[in-house]
């Protein structure tokens, strides 16, 4: 602790805001929970800090961070999933703030794959489906879905839909004709987990078919 | 002020069933592992089973592992123990126990099970 | 599962100090945190050490826990005894899905 005051790092860390934000991802990597961790300033000098979670463990008490440039990081099988851990922050052996926290309750999802559209000439709509990994998990299965969707002209112009399962059907009179159309989701934990919303996946553009004159109906691509 | 309040105790003949309740206030419930722990008459503290916040994570001693189920209601701030196949050396005095700060930080007043014929 | 052995009496006078050990069977003391529960006669457990060595508040600070890894044992050491502090003390330690508590030691001030 001496050796970090002498040079009067230990001072100046303690006026500075150490407030961080944490996401775990449960089985991530076959049976590997991982944790990220990080600051919520930016500005933060990160040189000599480090992070330490301690409780709700298998078979050890504490374990340290892997520092991955501005992010915290740990993959590990021993998060016990029960109960609060204590996640520090760390010079020395000093802590500089704490926070108690229960990894099931900041879920974040791994982001939705393969999204795609297909358009069914004869239904007039469009089945919307995408996967999740999440199907194969233990733990974490049920999850809500955020599928978002625009015109590509319409920069902030989005409809979102909520839906639990992986399909979706859009309704091509809802959609304007002849028109490029964006569409991607995204997933939160929906049962038994709390947390966050996952990355969005790639976003998938299709195109609307143009209306058929003597039919009203639109044609397909 | 936390206060856990154990109820549904009382004597069963052997390879009947119980189930006690545990009413819980004075915190945020749905917040808390929680957690039943047994005290035979004149002897130590076993611990039974846990139940996590969401309901999900649960786990038991192998004492009772497949004749007792733990659940809870957190609409209604409530602990539940599931009894079957009740023996005669289940016959304890069961606390129901909240997990905070540390692993036990409440407990309540205990509720007793007496197993005989 | 390991076992958690604890002695099942101790004895000290008024002022004196006592040390209740806590062996673990298998497996490291280090894996996971202990903690230490006193039992009065005829009431609940209450916790007077969590994670090895903290203090809840409001337990005065004659009681303190340490771990001995070359012994692989936890102790409760009660310092300046009191008539108040007679009663049953438990050591408890989970692995990575039970919990699991010494058999408990009783504790009589003369």
């Known amino acids: 602790e001496s050796g970090y005051a002498q040079n009067g790092d230990l001072e100046d860390a303690e006026l500075d805001d150490y407030s961080f934000s944490c996401y775990s991802q449960l089985e991530v990597n076959g049976s590997q929970h991982s944790l990220t961790c990080a600051f919520e300033d930016p500005d933060v000098n990160i040189t000599n800090l480090e992070f330490e979670i301690c409780g709700a463990l298998v078979e050890v008490k504490c374990l340290n961070f892997r520092k991955l440039q501005e992010i915290y990081f740990i993959e590990t099988k021993k998060f016990l999933l029960i109960g609060k851990s204590n996640i520090c922050v760390k010079v020395g052996e000093k802590s500089l703030t704490c926070k108690k926290i229960d990894l099931t309750t900041i879920v974040k999802p791994e982001a939705p794959f393969d999204l795609s559209v297909v358009y069914r000439e004869g239904a007039n709509d469009f089945v919307v489906t995408f996967n999740t990994s999440h199907l194969q998990k233990k733990y974490v299965k049920v999850l809500m879905h955020d599928v978002a969707y625009r015109q590509e002209k319409d920069e902030n112009k989005w409809t979102h839909v909520n839906l639990s399962s992986t399909k979706l059907t859009l309704l091509q009179r809802k959609l304007q004709p002849a028109a490029m159309y964006e569409i991607k989701v995204r997933s939160i934990p929906d049962h038994y987990f709390k947390g966050f919303w996952s990355e969005w996946s790639p976003s998938y553009y299709f195109r609307t078919p143009e209306i058929n004159n003597s039919s009203g109906e639109m044609d397909p691509i | 002020q936390v206060n856990l309040r154990e109820s549904g105790g009382g004597l069963v003949k052997p390879g009947g069933s119980l189930r006690l309740s545990c009413a819980a206030s004075?915190?945020?419930?749905?917040?808390?592992?929680m957690h039943w722990v047994r005290q035979a008459p004149g002897k130590g503290l076993e611990w039974l089973s846990l139940v996590g916040w969401d309901g999900f994570f649960t786990y038991y001693a192998d004492s009772v592992k497949g004749r007792f189920t733990i659940s809870r209601d957190n609409t209604k701030n409530l602990l539940y123990l599931q009894m079957n196949s009740l023996r005669a050396e289940d016959t304890a005095v069961y606390y129901c126990?909240?997990?905070?700060?540390?692993?036990?930080?409440?407990w309540g007043q205990g509720t007793l099970v007496t197993v005989s014929s | 599962n390991f076992m958690l052995t604890q002695p099942h009496s101790v004895s000290g006078s008024p002022g004196k100090t006592v040390t209740i050990s806590c062996t673990r069977s298998?497996?490291?003391?280090?894996?996971?945190?202990v903690q230490w529960y006193q039992q009065r006669p005829g009431n609940s457990p209450t916790t007077v050490i969590y994670e090895d060595d903290q203090r809840p508040s409001g337990v005065p600070d004659r009681f303190s826990g340490s771990i001995d890894s070359s012994s692989n044992s936890a102790s409760l050491t009660i310092s300046g005894l009191v008539t108040e502090d007679e009663a049953d003390y438990y050591c408890?330690?989970?692995?990575?899905?039970?919990?699991?508590f010494g058999g408990g030691t009783k504790l009589t001030v003369l």
């Open positions: 126990a909240r997990q905070g700060d540390y692993v036990f930080n409440n």
């Open positions: 298998s497996g490291s003391i280090d894996s996971s945190y």
């Open positions: 004075g915190f945020t419930f749905d917040d808390s592992v």
């Open positions: 408890m330690q989970y692995d990575s899905s039970h919990l699991v």
